[in-house]
């Protein structure tokens, strides 16, 4: 006899885990025989797809390789034609071992921003997401939190928070880990301890001091008066991310200091800034303090001008006076570059001999300065023009540094050769007599303001600077 | 930080050349005087040679005046030692040394670790 | 030819006060010798004390003191310490004819 379609073993739900097998069973009592048809939510399952296995007359389905996707309702639909259609539907719950499907990956953060660590994993059931940072849990607080998608948020990022970390994934089929990342916290340039501002004497040594810190550690650069430092030496040396440098300097003139440090995040730089005044006590104190000693002089630029074996003296109001005399005269001889041939060499000998003054040893030892006519010898005859031109420089605050000042003695203010031959010295490099000077142009209107002495006269006509030392 | 470090130390015939060259960095090479300074195994230093800071003049122990030369490249912040006619007893390690100012003469005020010369056959 | 002469060797007790001699074997040291001075530990490269008879160099311990006595230099070691024990040169600048620069034979100093 007939008989309508019955479904004797309704569908249940199946787990099944990702890449295995799974069958749902459609067991139907009916005559005829009926036909059973399959859905997947409701959307029919073709005979011929090959991921699929229908048999035993369409009541067995088997999903041959189980797919994250295959997930869903399935039902079987059996009809004969006598009564009725029936069905019967069940779930497939694709069970799936726990994966990461967009793990974290290396971070570089600035201090006090928000950091993100990527973790989206994959399961079911859904897996539960930590983090360990180092080789112990991470726990969560105020700042830290574990999002409900698995990444991790730090607010306010701070230094301590640098460091390894990695992602767990885990439910009840099993765990994976994310690969270690590393999370860098830098920081902007920060200077812990700014230089100080000094008031020193001329030719003092004065070292300007600066500690900064950040990360990656900065590098620290001096800046005097707007411009790369030109002189100098600097000392650095960098202990636990702080870096400290000591710039030392031979002080000729005042000047502002600055010390900045600088670090690079990406493509962008931070820096920090600090700076400090040298300025220069009493300006013509060198020169009017007669403290100091006497010495062979033994440096340089005045080796041509001043006698082999001369005794000049040497100002202890400088730090290290001999340095300074002889930066004073090399800073003024380069001066002297650009003027006339005439003027020169003259010039270069008032210079040698006025800051490297030839010294009367004693009890005190005393400076012996230049008689004023041959000062005046230089000033109003060969370097007339030269002197109007500092002059007017002077006035209108031309030069780079005072240190000129203290190179140029004031003619008027020094000794007569007439009042005390033994109390001033004499130039023994003009070497000229009252018929050289006749062939030189006059350089300027006025006549000048005292007798030219007779100098030591020289075999040559002209005028020439001459190594060999002679004392009227 | 100022650092001197030489280099062209070595073994060498007596009657052979050997030319030292000692590289600065951490101050401005120009403005300083250099000198080469050295000391013999279980001796004493010994002054050998002594250059200002613009290079213009140079000055050497008598010992070695003819054989020795100093020289110094500014644009390459380098002081050098041209040693030539070696004989044994210029053996020693050779210092290069830093003047506290431009001044040839001034103190040494900062040394290198030494390159040694061993002049010997 | 004249020699820079130093005492072979000196010793000290911690805290004591000690004054090392420079001198040259004909004739006096003069500021015109700008003497300096250098301690030397064994191995070590040399380090400057003292520049142009008494200033002292940057980062020098005011222990170390630098004069002239009568005709010669002298460096003075007050309260000394157990890493004062080493090696110390004088250097004088000299002139005669030509510029030279001499170190003293060293002095070898012991902190008992």
């Known amino acids: 006899l007939p008989k309508a379609p019955v479904i004797t073993t309704p569908l249940e739900t199946v787990d099944a885990l990702v890449e295995e097998v799974a069958t749902f069973m459609c067991a139907v009592e009916s005559y005829p025989q009926p036909e059973i048809s399959w859905t997947r939510n409701k959307i029919l399952i073709k005979l011929f797809d090959t991921r699929y296995s229908i048999r035993e007359n369409g009541q067995l389905l088997t999903i041959l390789s189980v797919e994250d996707s295959d997930d869903g309702i399935y039902c079987c639909t059996a009809n004969n034609g006598v009564g009725g259609a029936v069905e019967s539907c069940g779930a497939l719950q694709v069970k799936m071992k726990p994966k990461i499907t967009r793990p974290p990956i290396n971070v570089k953060i600035i201090e006090g921003l928000k950091a993100v660590l990527p973790c989206t994993t994959m399961g079911n059931p859904k897996p539960s997401v930590s983090w360990i940072k180092g080789d112990s849990p991470l726990r969560e607080n105020s700042r830290i939190a574990v999002l409900e998608s698995g990444s991790l948020r730090i607010h306010n990022v701070q230094k301590e928070d640098a460091g390894q970390y990695r992602c767990v994934a885990k439910n009840s089929l099993g765990t994976a880990y994310s690969k270690v990342v590393k999370l860098e916290v830098e920081v902007f340039a920060r200077i812990l301890r700014a230089p100080e501002s000094h008031n020193v004497t001329f030719g003092s040594f004065v070292t300007l001091h600066c500690t900064a810190t950040g990360i990656p550690v900065p590098t620290i650069t001096w800046i005097e008066n707007g411009n790369a430092v030109s002189s100098g030496s600097i000392q650095e040396s960098v202990k636990d991310r702080v870096i400290d440098s000591r710039l030392q300097l031979f002080i000729t003139k005042p000047g502002l200091y600055t010390c900045i440090a600088t670090n690079k995040h990406g493509e962008k730089f931070s820096t920090a800034k600090a700076a400090a005044t040298i300025s220069i006590a009493e300006w013509s104190k060198p020169q009017k303090d007669n403290k100091g000693y006497c010495a062979q002089y033994r440096g340089e630029v005045c080796n041509a001008v001043l006698a082999k074996d001369a005794l000049v003296f040497l100002n202890t109001s400088y730090a290290d006076p001999e340095e300074a005399q002889e930066l004073l005269v090399h800073t003024a001889w380069n001066e002297l570059k650009v003027v006339s041939p005439v003027c020169r060499p003259a010039a270069e000998a008032l210079l040698c001999n006025h800051i490297f003054q030839e010294c009367s040893p004693g009890v005190v030892p005393t400076p012996i300065p230049i008689c004023r006519e041959y000062c005046l010898a230089v000033k109003e005859l060969f370097c007339a023009k030269e002197w109007l031109v500092m002059e007017e420089k002077t006035h209108r605050g031309l030069y780079r540094s005072e240190m000129h000042l203290l190179s140029v003695p004031e003619c008027s203010k020094l000794p007569s050769m007439h009042w005390d031959p033994t109390a001033c010295a004499r130039l023994p490099h003009l070497d000229y007599n009252k018929e050289n000077l006749k062939t030189f142009p006059p350089m300027t209107s006025s006549k000048p303001s005292v007798d030219i002495p007779n100098l030591p006269s020289s075999s040559s006509s002209s005028f020439s600077v001459s190594p060999t030392y002679s004392m009227t | 930080e100022v650092q001197l470090l030489e280099s062209g130390g070595g073994l060498v015939q007596p009657g052979g050349s050997l030319r030292l060259s000692c590289a600065a960095s951490?101050?401005?090479?120009?403005?300083?005087?250099m000198s080469w300074v050295r000391q013999a195994p279980g001796k004493g230093l010994e002054w050998v040679s002594a250059i200002p800071g613009s290079g213009g003049s140079t000055y050497y122990k008598e010992s070695v005046k003819g054989r020795f030369t100093i020289s110094r490249d500014n644009s390459k912040n380098t002081l050098y030692l041209q040693m030539n006619s070696l004989r044994a007893e210029d053996t020693a390690v050779y210092y290069c040394?830093?003047?506290?100012?431009?001044?040839?003469?001034?103190?040494?005020?900062?040394w290198g670790q030494g390159t040694l010369v061993t002049v010997s056959s | 030819q004249t020699v820079v002469t130093q005492e072979p060797s000196f010793s000290v007790s911690p805290g004591g006060t000690v004054t090392l001699t420079c001198g040259l074997s004909?004739?006096?040291?003069?500021?015109?010798?700008?003497p300096d001075w250098y301690q030397q530990t064994p191995g070590q490269a040399p380090r400057t004390l003292i520049y142009?008879?008494?200033s002292r160099h940057s980062g020098v311990p005011d222990r170390f003191s630098g004069s002239i006595l009568g005709n010669k230099a002298a460096l003075t070691i007050t309260g000394a310490q157990a890493d004062d024990e080493s090696d110390y040169y004088c250097?004088?600048?000299?002139?005669?004819?030509?510029?030279?620069?001499?170190f003293g034979g060293g002095t070898k100093l012991t902190v008992l």
């Open positions: 250097g004088l600048y000299m002139y005669s004819g030509s510029k030279n620069y001499v």
């Open positions: 040394a830093k003047r506290s100012g431009r001044i040839a003469f001034g103190a040494l005020d900062a």
């Open positions: 142009s008879t008494d």
């Open positions: 951490g101050f401005t090479f120009s403005d300083y005087g």
């Open positions: 004909s004739g006096s040291v003069t500021s015109s010798n700008y």
